[in-house]
Amino acid sequence: QEGKFSGPLKPMTFSIYEGQEPSQIIFQFKANPPAVTFELTGETDNIFVIEREGLLYYNRALDRETRSTHNLQVAALDANGIIVEGPVPITIKVKDINDNRPTFLQSKYEGSVRQNSRPGKPFLYVNATDLDDPATPNGQLYYQIVIQLPMINNVMYFQINNKTGAISLTREGSQELNPAKNPSYNLVISVKDMGGQSENSFSDTTSVDIIVTENIWKAPKPVEMVENSTDPHPIKITQVRWNDPGAQYSLVDKEKLPRFPFSIDQEGDIYVTQPLDREEKDAYVFYAVAKDEYGKPLSYPLEIHVKVKDINDNPPTCPSPVTVFEVQENERLGNSIGTLTAHDRDEENTANSFLNYRIVEQTPKLPMDGLFLIQTYAGMLQLAKQSLKKQDTPQYNLTIEVSDKDFKTLCFVQINVIDINDQIPIFEKSDYGNLTLAEDTNIGSTILTIQATDADEPFTGSSKILYHIIKGDSEGRLGVDTDPHTNTGYVIIKKPLDFETAAVSNIVFKAENPEPLVFGVKYNASSFAKFTLIVTDVNEAPQFSQHVFQAKVSEDVAIGTKVGNVTAKDPEGLDISYSLRGDTRGWLKIDHVTGEIFSVAPLDREAGSPYRVQVVATEVGGSSLSSVSEFHLILMDVNDNPPRLAKDYTGLFFCHPLSAPGSLIFEATDDDQHLFRGPHFTFSLGSGSLQNDWEVSKINGTHARLSTRHTEFEEREYVVLIRINDGGRPPLEGIVSLPVTFCSCVEGSCFRPAGHQTGIPTVGM
């Protein structure tokens, strides 16, 4: 039939593995009159032949390393040898097999590396070549260090890039290599083809001798530089040196400062270029880089640390132009009025920033001077002599001297005398009633306004009201914001409400002042209010315990076996009904109540594993909301597929009469899983009666050779039955038939008078 093996003359491409003895024709070209024969030209290498009737074949094994692509041309000729069709290009792509071992270019390599070289930076390359195709695993090389000598504490100091053969230091090697301790190392390197992934890969080894040299590219000690230096700049502060002359040095400011006050010269000397200000920046960390003439870094950058030493060049500063404190009438002696906190930009916890406080003036001095005192080091103001009266003096102004060891600064404090806090906040309502909200009400929503009043002096800490929820909201779902002008409280939602955990909350508010109440006055029931928050249910879909459920069973489990289960819960506590969706193969059923999943048909790994279906959980009753999860059933292989021939072997032939016993190669396969080593088939003749004429011998786990035992065969077709056993558990056997024709040949092909197109043999032996 036309198609895979025969057809009209047209450009075509065929792929053939190298190294295989010919076992099949490549193609049968069909001629259209007046064409009667075909001509093959191009890169035939006397391997490719086209027989008069258009049978294209090859007569010996190909070698990809000799020629990876054979560019051929086929023309159809008439009976006078004149081209009547074509020529058309026929491309034979020779597919690679692993028939070449990798070879190192040198049996010994030598190199040197400096201690502390950057990890991962190659200092030596080993190189191997493999004639096989680098686009296939056969030519993909994998380098490995077999041994490092000496090996200290079982730590590898060297590493190799598996693909490029680049040898570099590991992090440990970069840190620990020391020529004083060990000046030389030896590595044995292996290279494997097949990307190093196959036990059938070829390999080679080489030896690498490595000398470790000293590294003077080291970070200098941290530098201390006094701020505001008046010496002429630039000033050399430290230095770095590369191991060899000719390096180009530069500094890298990782912080991207607007002003970077350091430079480096081409000797590696580092300078500060202008006076530093500790209060602007107290430490600098930057990097010194050494590059080669092409601008490529020679090694890792060195970290340079510069600490700026403080001098006392900053006076204390006041927190604000005037600091305001309040004090109630009749407050007792020693009560704290407030703390004045001044600042000094000089270095903390040093004499340069250690501050002293002293009151230098009080106005008015009524009823006397010295009413207040300030703690010398803490800055805390206290009532010193007597209680104050608002009607006599409602406001005092203090001038306070704040000093460090060299500078003095004056700060101003205003002390307002306010009413005593003898009035408590009183709620307008003690019960704000019930409020019903859906559980999905937005966060940030204001749900209630509350109001308390306080008769103390307005706009003082005695009359300011702060609201707190003291009961009924342990989860902190609510909060209260206060308007400072009106003391109105706005109750807002801070966290989502939840019907399932708190359907009803009895909330209690307390109203308080920031100022303490006077002695003898206490908050009472008037400062408390309540309200009841009722949260209504919003129906939510069931929730699966997992996004994906996974189970693993053998593909041969009995019908009705439980293969897995799923679980979901409904937030409202409704019952759940489970169902399956997407069970395209009809393999499974689910228990609607329990979520258990059972097989209802034979499973088959070869049809596809894992088998993916969706599970649906639906509320029973309510609004029948549902959610979906995945169930993945991983099928473990059992040996349930007998071996078979890997391809169609019709058209095998031997030329009659046989001049010597002949043989042909065939390949078997099966659809089961073959981990790691692949199939291990055994081959034998399918019936005893064949033993006189044929024998079958195993080549490897998948290929066998069928050979004739003698040469006395008739000119006809023989059907040879082959028994192939897969050696599995249980072992399965397939009986396959190989039809072999014995026919008269012309130039190695079955001869047929021209015009006869039936029964085309396709493989010559």
């Epitope: 001509e39 030209t41 041309q73 009976a79 006078n80 015009g755």
Partner: antibody, heavy 119, light 112 residues
Framework: QVQLVQSGAEVKKPGASVKVSCKAS????????IHWMRQRPGQGLEWIGY????????KYNEKFKDRATLTADTSTSTAYMELRSLRSDDTAVYYC????????????WGQGTTVTVSS | DIVMTQSPLSLPVTPGEPASISCRSS???????????LYWFLQKPGQSPQVLIY???NLASGVPDRFSGSGSGTDFTLKISRVEAEDVGVYYC?????????FGQGTKLEIK
Amino acid sequence: QVQLVQSGAEVKKPGASVKVSCKASGYTFTDHTIHWMRQRPGQGLEWIGYIYPRDGYTKYNEKFKDRATLTADTSTSTAYMELRSLRSDDTAVYYCARFYYGYWYFDVWGQGTTVTVSS
Amino acid sequence: DIVMTQSPLSLPVTPGEPASISCRSSKSLLRSNGNTYLYWFLQKPGQSPQVLIYRMSNLASGVPDRFSGSGSGTDFTLKISRVEAEDVGVYYCMQHLEYPFTFGQGTKLEIK
């Protein structure tokens, strides 16, 4: 041995037809093509056409396409060339020749047939 | 059609001397298979033609080896290393790369 034997000389009047035969022997007649050429007095050779006896396929020189017919009888291994509407300038020696399949050259020629066209 | 041009048209030669006949085609006769489709034959007086050289340089069976053919895609030469009396006749070149087959005018070799 391989031989091509042509029919005898012919004298024809203008407007008539002539049919020259070429009998092959010593090989399988259907394996090779038979070509016809002519040589006019004192002139070079002209190719008339060929026939492939295996399937009867023919090809003609455009110049002779309308007047020449090539046929073959495989039972007698004989090829024929008929030329119609003869003119005086068709006077020539007509040759058949075997074109050797696979080697692609004229290896055997007939002895030639003289056709004279005269009123 | 491909035009074949021979020269000289007449060639008188002394026996024992070499002879050379040239043939030129209007199109290259070299095909991608490496073969050049040029044919040389001889027509002795009163005889039918007989093959000498096929595919430009191949000596036909039974032809004396004093005959040889050579050339490029369009320029061809037939050489006789030592002419003998029996070599007289008209020598033709012919192309069979494509239809119609075409012939040179012929070169008449005669003995001086």
